[in-house]
């Protein structure tokens, strides 16, 4: 769940709110679990910097020690820096906490790039701009790391919000959200609004930026427009979903839908990019290249290695196609689609040499571990992780970056047959083989 293409990711200033609010459909209101309506105290509780992750402020221990914690729906450990490190301004000091309990167990977590290890314990944890509760949670105190912490990222730990099945060292280590729900009356649901910057940030802006909202225990209607569409969580490990069709500017990629989910498709706030399986990536790039052929870009751009720049304010958004992913719906043979704009999949980065230009990286990349719907997707939408009903909801985000011609969209229903066949069944292997596949 980390680094390179997997976490960290990007954040920044909230994009301009939509001037026009679509009328809210009310047919699903009664289905929503948890508190409804306004969660004022949790709105804008996420911050971050471009490409470096969205973090929430948390406190651990007694007396409380404040830390910024990266929000990661692609892992399941709550882990915090607990020893001095050149990139950390502060870290969890267990010896100063009267409520810390040592579990006398170690944990090691490798990512595609980067890794960390630490000691397991429990302590009291709260989220100042979250629900007014304190819970005893498992904490991995990170004592050693390599390419995990990021210089200047401003976060000191990671909050894994996925399920126990992928927790390290094994599934007996209860994840934070499970502890929260068990120990309080908070409904088993959270939602994320990640607000991409939409333009390169200079240092001052980046530090001051608000990055979005993590609503714990429900849904805040001010954070989205239109209606929420839900897709089933296929299996409770990662937040695994099933993609049934992919279109580039309305043109079907026409691949066997199993390819889209090979070997899984997950929703992961700890990944920057939209990552696609090799075959799907190649087909998608070919189609995006064809659609944007009025301008030529170097191969390095499509590989995510090179920037492309335009004079400030002249980015030709219109030459780039929209990308639509069709997700399995809650009703048999019914799907819905989520559509992102180039404003989501072209990631703004500051090019020091040409700071008067607007520069971007192509934020769709190749994966060997399935489709990863990272920040590139999530920044277009308000995403509801309805664990209680084993489903994930998508609605157009009130803060997504768009232009006067196109907007991100969530639309349905569409008739799609045999969607169950789109899921890939991973061959049963021993646990160690399974876990090393995490990226």
């Amino acid at each position: 769940t980390h680094l390179g293409i997997r976490l960290p990711l990007r954040s920044g200033l909230a994009g301009p709110p939509l001037g026009l609010r679509l009328p809210r459909e009310t047919d699903e209101e009664s289905e929503e679990p948890g508190r409804r309506g306004s969660f004022v105290e949790m709105v804008d509780n996420l911050r971050g910097k471009s490409g470096q992750g969205y973090y929430v402020e948390m406190t651990v221990g007694s007396p409380p020690q404040t830390l910024n914690i990266l929000v990661d729906t692609g892992s399941s450990n709550f882990a915090v820096g607990a020893a001095p490190h050149p990139f950390l301004h502060r870290y969890y000091q267990r010896q100063l906490s009267s409520t810390y309990r040592d579990l006398r167990k170690g944990v090691y977590v490798p990512y595609t790039q980067g890794k960390w290890e630490g000691e397991l314990g429990t302590d009291l944890v709260s989220i100042p701009h979250g629900p007014n509760v304190t819970v005893r949670a498992n904490i991995a105190a990170i004592t050693e790391s390599d390419k995990f912490f990021i210089n200047g990222s401003n976060w000191e730990g990671i909050l894994g919000l996925a399920y126990a099945e992928i927790a390290r060292p094994d599934d007996s280590l209860e994840p934070f959200f499970d502890s929260l729900v068990k120990q309080t009356h908070i409904p088993n649901i959270f939602s994320l609004q990640l607000c991409g910057a939409g333009f390169p940030l200079n240092q001052t802006e980046a530090l001051a930026s608000v990055g979005g909202s993590m609503i714990i225990g429900g849904i805040d209607h001010s954070l989205y427009t239109g209606r929420l569409w839900y897709t089933p969580i296929r299996r409770e490990w990662y937040y695994e979903v099933i993609i049934v069709r992919v279109e580039i500017n309305g043109q079907d990629l026409k691949m066997d839908c199993k390819e889209y989910n090979y070997d899984k498709s997950i929703v992961d706030s700890g990944t920057t990019n939209l990552r696609l399986p090799k075959k799907v990536f190649e087909a998608a790039v070919k189609s995006i290249k064809a659609a944007s052929s009025t301008e030529k870009f170097p191969d390095g751009f499509w590989l995510g290695e090179q920037l492309v720049c335009w004079q400030a304010g002249t980015t030709p958004w219109n030459i780039f196609p929209v990308i639509s992913l069709y997700l399995m719906g809650e009703v048999t043979n019914q799907s819905f689609r989520i559509t992102i704009l180039p404003q989501q999949y072209l990631r703004p980065v500051e090019d020091v040499a040409t700071s008067q230009d607007d520069c971007y990286k192509f934020a769709v990349s190749q994966s060997s571990t399935g489709t990863v719907m990272g920040a590139v997707i999530m920044e277009g939408f308000y995403v509801v992780f309805d664990r209680a009903r084993k489903r994930i909801g998508f609605a157009v985000s009130a803060c997504h970056v768009h232009d006067e011609f196109r907007t991100a969209a969530v639309e349905g229903p569409f008739v799609t047959a045999d969607m169950e066949d789109c899921g890939y069944n991973i061959p049963q292997t021993d646990e160690s083989t399974l876990m090393t596949g995490r990226a």
Epitope: A83, G106, V107, Y108, E117, E119, E144
Partner: antibody, heavy 124, light 107 residues
């Protein structure tokens, strides 16, 4: 070839102190966790202490916690065990062992090879 | 602390016979268990790590199995050089602990 050579053992009175050293060669010392394990005469093995590659993480058996200190000098490729308040039950051959990586918990990161050991005798 | 109980304490066998050594943990150690061999006057050497993986240079006649609380080291056909003391060790929890050892002696 990996070589680990322990030194610093000997006879010491109860309550006394000793500092064991383990000189390492044949590998990039700073990239590997290290450990001390002891074996009382005619008895089994007992893990004593471990330290991560950077030296940032240290761990001890309950029987030595607060009395022994593990440390390393990566510039000198040397591992140390400072032993204070020694007791008769600390009498043993002390082995240093190289970890499988800089990590203490990584799969496969077990301790091998071991040095030949140095004998510590605590007696009045 | 996790207690590792090895059985039998002594195993008397002839060369060519199959040796089965047991190690039982007082609580689950997942697969964080290894086996070491120690000959008189020598330092221990790693045979099996992570319950079932043979260490570099260890002959195929040595195999490990098990996970959780019950583990087995099997020597399919004893060679003269295999007569030694065998220890299991866990590093799932602190403190890391060794079993009491099984001595494999010539019958």
């Amino acid at each position: 070839e990996v070589q680990l050579l322990e030194s610093g053992g000997g006879l010491v009175q109860p309550g006394g102190s000793l500092r064991l050293s383990c000189a390492a060669s044949g590998f990039t010392f700073s990239s590997y966790a290290m450990s001390w394990v002891r074996q009382a005469p005619g008895k089994g093995l007992e893990w004593v202490s471990a330290i991560s590659g950077s030296g940032g993480s240290t761990y001890y058996a309950d029987s030595v916690k607060g009395r022994f200190t593990i440390s390393r000098d990566n510039s000198k490729n040397t591992l140390y065990l400072q032993m204070n308040s020694l007791r008769a039950e600390d009498t043993a051959v002390y082995y240093c062992a190289k970890g499988g990586s800089q990590w203490l918990y990584a799969p496969g990161s077990w301790f091998d090879p071991w040095g030949q050991g140095t004998l510590v005798t605590v007696s009045s | 602390e996790i207690v590792l109980t090895q059985s039998p304490a002594t195993l008397s066998l002839s060369p060519g016979e199959r040796a089965t050594l047991s190690c039982r943990a007082s609580q689950s150690v997942s697969s964080y268990l290894a086996w070491y061999q120690q000959k008189p006057g020598q330092a221990p050497r790693l045979l099996i790590y992570d319950a079932s993986n043979r260490a570099t240079g260890i002959p195929a006649r040595f195999s490990g199995s098990g996970s959780g609380t019950d583990f087995t080291l099997t020597i399919s056909s004893l060679e003269p050089e295999d007569f030694a003391v065998y220890y299991c060790v866990q590093r799932s929890n602190f403190p890391w602990t060794f079993g009491g050892g099984t001595k494999v002696e010539i019958k």
